[in-house]
């Protein structure tokens, strides 16, 4: 049903979406102070602009007896029941902030007439690309998928001369609702990673994973993980690991790997962490302060929605246009917008573009080091480090099959 | 457009130091890395190291470990490098030379001659 | 190290000649890629990853090879190619140049 929006006459309201199922289990306190600290900065920012007009944020919530999991698994008609709420009050703002679940947020899209943007800190899934009114303010599969495969394909870096055709991916299904998608995306075989691979064998038992750590006969030296360096120890442990391993480590939500104290354990040798240019400011900004460091990437999303929705609605005040129109819910994507922590890049679907680095564990210093970044939005690799201080021979990333011999030239022209 | 502008000719006297600059211009500094390349009269080119300006990561040619130091100044788009305890070998034309990777050494200075001689 | 030897170390042609020149690596190499410098300059980026003409290069030029053969052929020779030529390697660390080949006017 068409609901009305309050969204007009200089006072701008924005809906969100406080769910019990959630993509990070945050308490919804800390979401609500990010929100109100974004309506401050847009607040004043509209002021500077000369725009004298009202921006509010409604918090929308569900019904805690009937979804209470707090898991993503079970948010499909969470969603939907929300929406039916907002219909029922008559009270839709100009724009909706949540779900970060991809079931919800698939399942929202597929019944409701959207002609409002929709906001997502989460929606990871493949199944929620390149749909017109959703935009996505944390890295979603598709860019991750598009990383690793220019990552294999290379083979012109001093170290790493062989292009990879081939990995295992380590999935057991206990994953957090990021590494789910994320996984999910690398497993499906209609994907571009599958597409673009030779072999890819999906293990789902730890033991599986386990023995392929020394199995002579593995049919490929590289195994996807996603997870913290913890996730890893406890399935791996201080197990001997054959020496032409590679562990592809996804973190991408962790700031710990930047802060000055870490030490690389032991067990992370063999791994190259995938995680992303950490903030410069959040550390001590206010709404951060009491966050995690995987934490604060989710509360940030939803603070930078808000400025993201700030940043619309003053273009479309000093364009003198309508902010209830199809036009302004397609207009959240192909745009740079100042964010909390500087500026944010959305691509032509509307999802955020990011600077993701690799790193390695030095065997000299025992820290994490970068090794090289990757820029989402141009999907260009910049090398770092030219000569790390590998674990593997000659510090050269070994091939990806054993025994292929010297065989660098996969070349892809 | 894309310009490197190193610094004017140095004549020094064998035992000093000489510090080389590079100015970075039309694009942004900490998104590339510096290379820094020796030409000696008649010699072939030689790479003496490369730095990542945004995380100050350095790697130098074994060769030069103990003669060159590679700095950088970010907030001025510069980065440096100083050659120490000279000697008349290190007379020399000296290149900073930017990557664009997968293009390495795509952008060149015009170079500084540095002339060892008592 | 690689070493890299480049033949022809001077090369005399005339205009509108096709001109070849070796670049041979001390063991196998991915990519090769190639300079041009003249007296007085600083040296260009020609050919990056063995083939890619840098932006500027007239198409006249062209590099194949692979292993340890690489070649940079200029298929017909005009007066502004006449300068220095050098290969280079990034497969190995550290990145190792060529010796050159000067391309002199017959």
């Known amino acids: 049903s068409q609901v009305s929006q309050n969204c007009h006459n200089g006072s701008y309201e924005i809906s969100v979406l406080m769910m019990g199922n959630s993509a990070f289990a945050e308490p919804l306190k800390n979401l609500e102070d990010a929100v109100n600290e974004g309506l401050e900065i847009v607040r004043g920012r509209l002021q500077n602009a000369g725009l004298n007009v009202t921006v509010n944020a409604t918090f929308m919530y569900s019904d805690g007896l009937i979804h209470n999991s707090g898991d993503c698994r079970s948010s499909t008609c969470e969603g939907l029941d929300l929406l039916r709420k907002i219909s029922n009050a008559q009270r839709m703002g100009c724009v909706l902030i949540g779900p970060s679940c991809t079931y919800s947020t698939f399942q929202m899209y597929l019944d409701t007439e959207l002609s409002y943007p929709m906001i997502s800190a989460g929606s990871f899934g493949l199944s929620c690309d390149y749909k017109e009114t959703l935009t996505r303010l944390m890295s979603p599969a598709r860019k991750l998928m598009y990383f690793l495969v220019n990552f294999w394909k290379t083979n012109d870096l001093p170290f790493k001369t062989y292009s990879w055709s081939t990995s295992y991916v380590y999935k057991n299904g206990t994953e957090t609702e990021d590494c789910f998608w994320y996984l999910n995306a690398l497993e499906a075989s209609v994907s571009y990673f599958s597409h673009e691979l030779g072999f890819k064998v999906v293990l789902r038992q730890d033991k599986e994973f386990q023995d392929i750590l020394m199995d002579h006969n593995r049919k490929s030296n590289v195994i996807i993980m996603c997870g913290g360096p913890e996730f890893l120890y406890k399935l791996k442990g201080d197990r001997a690991v054959a020496e032409d391993i590679v562990i592809i480590l996804v973190d991408l939500f962790n700031d710990q790997y930047f802060e000055d104290n870490v030490t690389a354990p032991d067990y992370m040798k063999n791994v190259l962490v995938l995680t992303l240019s950490p903030g410069n400011s959040l550390l001590n900004s206010s709404f951060s302060r009491n966050l995690s460091p995987t934490k604060r990437d989710f509360a940030l999303a939803y603070l930078n929605g808000i400025l993201l929705f700030g940043h619309m609605l003053k273009i479309f005040l000093e364009n003198g246009e309508n902010i209830t129109t199809p036009k302004f819910a397609h207009a959240f994507r192909n745009l740079t917008f100042e964010g909390y922590d500087g500026p944010v890049t959305l691509d032509d679907w509307g999802d955020v573009d990011s600077t993701m680095v690799l790193l390695y564990t030095s065997v000299d210093t025992k820290k994490y080091k970068v090794l090289l970044t990757y820029d989402t939005h141009v999907n260009k690799t910049y090398p770092v480090d030219m000569s790390p201080t590998f674990t593997w021979k000659n510090s050269k990333l070994p091939n990806d099959i054993t025994g292929r011999g010297p065989q660098h030239h996969h070349h892809h022209h | 457009e894309v310009q490197l502008v190193q610094s004017g000719a140095e004549v020094k006297k064998p035992g000093a130091s000489v510090k080389v600059s590079c100015k970075a211009s039309?694009?942004?500094?900490?998104?590339?890395?510096m290379n820094w390349v020796k030409q000696a009269p008649g010699q072939r080119l030689e790479w003496m190291g490369v730095?990542?300006?945004?995380?100050?990561?350095?790697n130098y040619n074994q060769k030069f470990k103990d003669k060159a130091t590679i700095t950088r100044d970010t907030s001025a788009s510069t980065a440096y490098m100083e050659l120490s305890s000279l000697r008349s070998e290190d007379t020399a034309v000296y290149y900073c030379?930017?990557?664009?990777?997968?293009?390495?050494?795509?952008?060149w200075g015009q170079g500084t001659t540095v002339t060892v001689s008592s | 190290d690689i070493q890299l030897t480049q033949s022809p170390s001077f090369l005399s042609a005339s205009p509108g000649d096709r001109v070849t020149i070796t670049c041979s690596a001390s063991s196998s190499v991915n990519y090769m890629y190639w300079y041009q410098q003249k007296p007085g300059s600083s040296p260009k980026s020609w050919i990056y990853?063995?083939?890619n003409l840098a932006s500027g290069v007239p198409s006249r030029f062209s590099g194949s090879g692979s292993g340890t053969e690489y070649t940079l052929t200029i298929s017909s020779l005009q007066p502004e190619d006449f300068a220095t030529y050098y290969c280079q390697q990034y497969h190995d660390y550290p990145p190792t140049f060529g010796g050159g080949t000067k391309v002199e006017i017959k």
């Open positions: 030379a930017r990557d664009d990777y997968p293009n390495y050494f795509d952008y």
């Open positions: 039309g694009y942004t500094f900490t998104d590339h890395n």
């Open positions: 730095m990542n300006p945004k995380f100050g990561t350095i």
């Open positions: 990853r063995t083939q």
